[in-house]
Amino acid sequence: VPLSRTVRCTCISISNQPVNPRSLEKLEIIPASQFCPRVEIIATMKKKGEKRCLNPESKAIKNLLKAVSKERSKRSP
């Protein structure tokens, strides 16, 4: 991100809307760090490759994270 900045968080807006795990291309979780004091979750949707930041505090998003980690643990040997 360019320009004068206070902290290096990249999410300007966040979505609280439920996301269907099947519509997800990719889910990036960026932990809080010295650069950004909050966890950032960036969802890339299969349709058009649209990227959105998700609200880590939202119940719907917490459920999504659980569903995704369950799916991953099923796939891993």
């Epitope: 991100v1 360019p2 320009l3 004068s4 900045r5 206070t6 902290v7 290096r8 968080c9 990249t10 999410c11 300007i12 807006s13 966040i14 979505s15 609280n16 950004c36 004091p37 909050r38 960036i42 058009k48 649209e50 990227k51 959105r52 930041c53 609200n55």
Partner: antibody, heavy 121, light 110 residues
Framework: QVQLVQSGGGVVQPGRSLRLSCAAS????????MHWVRQAPGKGPEWVAV????????YYADSVKGRFTISRDNSKTTLYLQMNSLRSEDTAVYYC??????????????WGRGTLVTVSS | QFVLTQPPSVSGAPGQRVTISCTGS?????????VHWYQQLPGTAPKLLIY???NRPSGVPDRFSGSKSGTSASLAITGLQAEDEADYYC??????????FGGGTKLTVL
């Protein structure tokens, strides 16, 4: 009703200060980044600044860096622009605008009606 | 002054098709950033017309369409109507500058 209601414009002398306000209603204000965009008479829009949904991240255009400060009060669902050391070239209609929510691709899906700031001696 | 380049004016008769071009650079369109278009009627705030290169917000007629290729983009208006007379601005995100706009194109319906 989803809207942005602006206030605080007027005539001000060069070197003086002014604060603009933008009251939001009808949407979840604390989920959206908010921008200020200005438009000089007869010219195209010029982006001024953005603030993240929680107020933690702020970015400014070079032309206002060090003079303007963007802030927000989520409890009052209001966005602010503090403008210091005003210059004649800051004369413009100032719009507040809601960020679209698209990651790293800032654009504006809701605009206020604008408030005129005239910097003149 | 404006990072994105648009023609100052275009015109067309009612019912005709007109296009408005918008030329960017490597740090905006060339870096994969989308183009967005706004319509500004006299004395009003800009209104989002096209987002993400070719998507219309609800309420925008399908006479309006957008496209982007490389460092160029365009807005097409078919079946031109008197109420389309307005200023049109392209906008993108620039990895060096943040939000950038075109200088605007005045559309005159003859």
């Amino acid at each position: 009703q989803v809207q942005l209601v602006q206030s605080g414009g007027g005539v001000v002398q060069p070197g003086r200060s002014l604060r603009l306000s933008c009251a939001a209603s009808g949407f979840t204000f604390n989920s959206y980044g908010m921008h200020w965009v200005r438009q000089a008479p007869g010219k195209g829009p010029e982006w001024v600044a953005v603030i993240s949904y929680d107020g933690n991240s702020k970015y400014y255009a070079d032309s206002v860096k060090g003079r303007f400060t963007i802030s927000r009060d989520n409890s009052k669902t209001t966005l602010y622009l503090q403008m210091n050391s005003l210059r004649s070239e800051d004369t413009a209609v100032y719009y507040c605008a809601r960020d679209s929510g698209s990651y790293l691709d800032w654009y504006f899906d809701l605009w206020g009606r604008g408030t005129l700031v005239t910097v003149s001696s | 002054q404006f990072v994105l380049t648009q023609p100052p004016s275009v015109s067309g008769a009612p019912g005709q098709r007109v296009t408005i071009s918008c030329t960017g650079s490597r740090s905006n369109f060339g870096a994969g950033h989308d183009v967005h278009w706004y319509q500004q009627l006299p004395g009003t705030a800009p209104k989002l017309l096209i987002y993400g290169n070719n998507n219309r917000p609800s309420g925008v007629p399908d006479r309006f369409s957008g496209s982007k290729s490389g460092t160029s983009a365009s807005l097409a208006i078919t079946g031109l109507q008197a109420e389309d007379e307005a200023d049109y601005y392209c906008q993108s995100y620039d990895s060096r500058l943040g939000v950038v706009f075109g200088g605007g194109t005045k559309l005159t319906v003859l």
